[in-house]
């Protein structure tokens, strides 16, 4: 039985040209995490974090994706095309697969600065 739950950073926005951290956290299960896959809205793989072997960043993203912090992923040099859904897929044993969703909106610099000024802390 799958008892775990995934918490994510939810809906986030970031500035064009800037960077953003995507984070997921699996809780409420004793299952062993064997691998965490990070995927983009078009289902292309960004990176794999294997529990024993570390990180593999996909060749197409090596210039713009940095591993971490933790099991998270840092996207750099953001473009408007990076707007969309991102998924963290936790492969666990014996539970199976857990999936979390994050929606990233990349904003033009002036818009991002404007919206940031009015965010509630």
């Amino acid at each position: 039985m799958m008892t775990g739950t995934i918490e994510t950073t939810g809906n986030i926005s970031a500035k064009k040209g800037g960077s953003v951290i995507l984070q997921c956290h699996l809780s409420s299960t004793m299952a062993q995490v064997t691998q965490v896959n990070w995927e983009q809205h078009d289902h292309s793989l960004l990176a794999i974090r294997n529990a024993e072997l570390g990180w593999h960043i996909y060749p197409a993203f090596k210039d713009r994706v940095a591993p971490g912090p933790g099991l998270g992923l840092t996207l750099q040099s953001l473009t408007m095309n990076d707007t969309g859904e991102y998924f963290c897929t936790y492969h666990t044993y014996p539970d199976g697969t857990y999936r979390g969703r994050i929606f990233l909106e990349v904003l033009e610099s002036s818009v991002a600065e404007h919206s940031a000024r009015f965010q509630i802390p």
């Epitope: 691998q35 292309s44 793989l45 529990a51 024993e52 072997l53 593999h56």
Partner: antibody
Framework: EVQLQESGPGLVKPSETLSLTCAVS????????WNWIRQPPGKKLEWIGY???????YYNPSLKSRVTISRDTSKNQFSLKLSSVTAADTAVYYC??????????????WGQGTTVTVSS | DIVMTQSPDSLAVSLGERATINCKAS??????VAWYQQKPGQSPKLMIY???YRYTGVPDRFSGSGSGTDFTLTISSLQAEDVAVYYC?????????FGGGTKVEIK
């Protein structure tokens, strides 16, 4: 150039333990991942498991209760033990290196393979 | 476990002609697929990783494509030295699994 060489008995009796060693030259086993993969006659290649650069192991759940992979860094070699063997464990056994950082789960260096037959 | 199914089991192609090998995953594996070549009496050799990236030293007549569940290895102009068994493998999730192989021969 990375080179891997399997060694061990070619014949093992049912219910006994299969033991193989892989000697690695040209590269340190304290980097990357070191794997055992087998191919029974007429069947698919099957991942048995691996030992990482740090000594952590992963075993295929279908074999987990019978498998142990260990290493000897002073000899730059790693080993496979498979207990309670049956005829279904008859296969060509390969040791292999995997550079996860660059190639993900794709194996870039293989040993030449050693045939193990389980028979009384 | 994810099952990788290759087709056809064997393929006979004339020298200089195109050879196409298919691999189907039982579930979506994105682009976490590798291809290997195994010549008679030898161990497998890595040809393609991440579905479409050629490994070091692999001739450019070999190409990989696909994502999701359907993948293809193409040899654009078959050479005598390409006679071998070709295997696909997924590493989207553990345990990493292989296809059953496709034997490529010369017609």
């Amino acid at each position: 150039e990375v080179q891997l060489q399997e060694s061990g008995p070619g014949l093992v009796k049912p219910s006994e333990t299969l033991s193989l060693t892989c000697a690695v030259s040209g590269y340190s086993i304290t980097s990357d991942s070191w794997n055992w993969i087998r191919q029974p006659p007429g069947k698919k290649l099957e991942w048995i498991g691996y030992i990482s650069y740090s000594g952590n192991t992963y075993y295929n759940p279908s074999l987990k209760s019978r498998v142990t992979i260990s290493r000897d860094t002073s000899k730059n070699q790693f080993s496979l033990k498979l207990s309670s063997v049956t005829a279904a464990d008859t296969a060509v056994y390969y040791c292999a290196r995997l550079d996860f950082s660059n190639y993900g789960g794709a194996v870039d260096y293989w040993g030449q393979g050693t045939t193990v037959t389980v028979s009384s | 476990d994810i099952v990788m199914t290759q087709s056809p089991d064997s393929l006979a192609v004339s020298l200089g002609e195109r050879a196409t090998i298919n691999c189907k995953a039982s579930q979506n594996v994105r682009t976490a697929v590798a291809w290997y070549q195994q010549k008679p009496g030898q161990s497998p050799k890595l040809m393609i990783y991440s579905a479409s990236y050629r490994y070091t030293g692999v001739p450019d007549r070999f190409s990989g494509s696909g994502s999701g569940t359907d993948f293809t290895l193409t040899i654009s102009s078959l050479q005598a030295e390409d006679v071998a068994v070709y295997y696909c493998q997924q590493y989207y999730t553990t345990p990493w699994t292989f296809g059953g192989g496709t034997k490529v021969e010369i017609k």
